[in-house]
């Protein structure tokens, strides 16, 4: 139903925490550099507006969209043009235009310092004194950073927070009770934050379909008991909104989220029995919950899919009868059916069904021609299978920290033209992988895979837009969003790749790296791997084997020895020769 | 929504000719092989004739090959089907549907060989 006040209407669904939190997440999100303080102060004279018009709907401005009053705001800041350069440009077009135009420059890599954590006491300290403030202000930091982190759900992991501090602060040993509690936080904030960042892109650079089907897919493996017409209700809702909190719509996203929740208890019995425990939570728990939901059990006796998608006469009547729900029923049976396979490997399966019916169904005899459709989508299942059994043998045998610097020089073979703290980066993102799912059992495996690597490579092309450096990589991530991942795994050295000259800085130690910790000499040693491919991209597995060997006996060397830094000076030198002469 | 209409049936004697027209709408009509079914009363549905999307591939029952022929013509999105040398077992209700179909979407046209 219409409501003559938006905002008077999402002020009322939400209450007045949930609403202020959205709105300094919104603000936090599109004006990423300005202070807290700045974004406070809009907060309230937007919630003081809103509780006018829940007053008086009709008061002036109320009907206006939420998207327009807050494009007002934005455009009424005083140091725009100053702190934000040419997106106060935006300010002279007409809304829709001047929304598309603002989301247009939010930026997935903000220049802004790591969040860091403070002490457990100053940590508690602050939260004491003002735990609203407190808490705020860790919205504040994770929006700016995170411009397209799913709002509903930060509200959620604040609530979290707030709860660790509670009971930590008043813990004897603050550390002890606090560092695992926010670690484990701050781990599950960052993947919802690759996810929904997955989902705006699957939205805003393949459309709405490629959405709708990446939540088919994985709404049928939740819920396997559901029927078709259910899990497409729910995916129609769903598409709502994401769409909207994709759009920076995140008062209407957050209480269409809310509905979307409500709906699904309300219909459990017909959705999933693992509803039961999520539906009895407070809010943002409860869809927090049917987020992260356990998936149901299979029901028993399910046909054979050949029956209805290779047997049966009807197949091309139905596909051209109702082509998206004819492959949508089809994505929903084989999905529920395969919890075991990954999002991707679904929809290439599905994609590769359609690709044959659109080849068959225009044929004299179709069903001759589809009939050995399954066997012939065999290699999509095989291929990724496959990979993640050789990649999990190589990090079972080398651990995280060699199978990062595998790697590492496997991507800068791909994509030389990347910079090095970028390859860095990934290496370690997409070694990581190996140590969140090799350990889990074999059905487990490939889906886990297969989605965070679908999550770090979407970060990558996001990254990679931003300042295009290498074809290959935009050939691979504009082409297919499903075939994105297989697009990386073909790609070998890259022939047209000159290499880079001999920079013996690249290669130069001081005693400080002895000094560092763990984590970072790593990045320091992984660094030196990518400039050393890049020289020589050709370079065979063994030479490498023995530059590596010789550079960390080198490094062992100088940090156990009494005058660390005469050593490096007088060794390093050696070394790089010896490394030349290796690879030469 | 998917249309197929079937025209040109009638009362034909034996050894005569008739063509059938199967006019199609609501999909896309080259991306999709085309059949005739038939169905004499009291019996189940026969395939009769299919021809592929551009026209190019035809398969024929072995009760009508020699004596009838499946066309279409994509300009208009138009099947048809020539049916020569009629004999009394060819009466029967004509459909057309898509792919390997036997099911029936338009109303059907009669065909009825009789002298």
């Known amino acids: 139903e219409a409501h003559k006040s938006e905002i008077a209407h999402r002020f009322n669904d939400l209450g007045e925490g949930h609403f202020k939190g959205l709105v300094l997440i919104t603000l936090s999100q599109h004006l990423q550099k300005s202070p807290f303080e700045e974004h406070v102060k809009l907060v309230n004279e937007v919630t003081d507006f809103a509780k006018a018009c829940v007053a008086d709907e009709s008061a002036q401005n109320c009907g206006k969209a939420i998207a327009t009053l807050f494009g007002d705001k934005v455009c009424a800041i005083p140091s725009l043009r100053e702190t934000y350069g040419e997106l106060a440009d935006c300010c002279a077009k007409e809304d829709p235009d001047r929304v598309e135009c603002f989301l247009q420059h939010k930026d997935d890599n903000p220049n802004l310092p790591p969040f860091e954590r403070p002490e457990p006491e100053a940590l508690c300290t602050a939260f004491k004194e003002n735990n609203d403030r407190f808490i705020g202000h860790y919205l504040y930091e994770v929006s700016r950073r995170h411009p397209y982190f799913y709002a509903p759900e930060l509200l959620y992991y604040a609530e979290k927070y707030k709860n660790a501090l509670t009971e930590c602060c008043e813990a004897a040993d603050k550390a002890a009770c606090l560092t695992p509690k926010l670690d484990a936080i701050k781990e599950k904030a960052l993947v919802s934050s690759a996810q929904q960042r997955l989902k705006c892109a699957s939205l805003q650079k393949f459309g709405e379909r490629a959405f709708k089907a990446w939540s088919v897919a994985r709404l049928s493996q939740k819920f396997p008991k559901a029927e078709f017409a259910e899990i497409s209700t729910i995916v129609t809702s769903l598409t709502k909104v994401t769409k909207e909190c994709c759009h920076g719509d995140l008062l209407e996203c957050a209480d269409d989220r809310q509905e979307l929740a409500k709906y699904m208890c309300e219909h459990q019995d017909s959705i999933s029995s693992k509803l039961k425990e999520c539906c009895v939570k407070p809010t943002l728990q409860k869809a927090h919950c049917i987020l992260e939901i356990q998936r149901d059990e299979l029901p028993t006796e399910l046909p054979d899919l050949a029956v209805d998608f290779v047997e049966d006469k009807e197949v091309c009547k139905n596909f051209a009868e109702a082509k998206d729900v004819f492959l949508g029923t089809f994505l929903y049976e084989y999905s529920r059916r395969h919890p075991e396979y990954s999002i991707g490997m679904l929809l290439r399966i599905a994609k590769g069904y359609e690709a044959k019916l659109e080849k068959c169904c225009a044929e004299a005899d179709p069903h001759a021609c589809y009939a050995k459709v399954f066997d012939e989508l065999q290699p999509l299942i095989d291929e990724p299978k496959k990979l993640v059994q050789q990649n999990c043998e190589l990090f079972d045998k080398l651990g995280e920290y060699g199978f990062q610097n595998a790697l590492a020089v496997r991507y800068t073979q791909k994509a030389p033209q990347v910079s090095t703290p970028t390859l860095v980066e990934y290496a370690r993102k997409l070694g990581s992988v190996g140590t969140k799912c090799c350990s889990l059992p074999e059905t487990e495996r490939l889906s886990c895979t297969e989605n965070y690597l679908a999550l770090i490579l979407n970060r990558l092309c996001i990254l990679h837009e931003k300042t295009p450096v290498s074809e290959r990589v935009t050939k691979c991530c504009t082409e297919s969003l499903v075939n994105r991942r297989p697009c990386f795994s073909a790609l070998h050295v890259d022939e047209t790749y000159v290499p880079k000259p001999f920079h013996a800085d690249s290669f130069t130690f001081h005693a400080d790296i002895c000094t560092l910790p763990e984590k970072e000499k790593q990045v320091k040693k992984q660094m030196a791997l990518v400039e050393l491919v890049k020289h020589k991209p050709k370079a065979s597995e063994e030479q490498m084997k023995t530059v590596m060997g010789d550079f960390a006996a080198f490094l062992k060397k100088c940090c156990d020895a009494d005058n660390k830094e005469a050593c490096f000076t007088e060794d390093g030198p050696k070394l790089v020769a010896k490394c030349q002469a290796t690879l030469a | 929504d998917v249309q197929l209409v079937e025209s040109g049936g009638g009362v034909v004697q034996p050894g005569g000719s008739l063509r059938l027209s199967c006019a199609a709408s609501?999909?896309?009509?080259?991306?999709?092989?085309m059949s005739w079914v038939r169905q004499a009363p009291g019996k189940g549905p026969e395939w009769v004739s299919s021809?592929?999307?551009?026209?190019?591939?035809?398969l024929y029952a072995d009760s009508v090959k020699g004596r009838f022929t499946i066309s279409r013509d994509n300009s208009k999105n138009t099947l048809y089907l020539q049916m020569n040398s009629l004999r009394p077992e060819d009466t029967a209700l004509y459909y057309c549907?898509?792919?390997?179909?036997?099911?029936?979407s338009g109303q059907g046209t009669l065909v009825t060989v009789s002298s």
């Open positions: 021809i592929s999307g551009s026209g190019s591939d035809t």
């Open positions: 549907t898509i792919g390997g179909s036997l099911s029936r």
């Open positions: 609501g999909f896309t009509f080259t991306s999709f092989g």
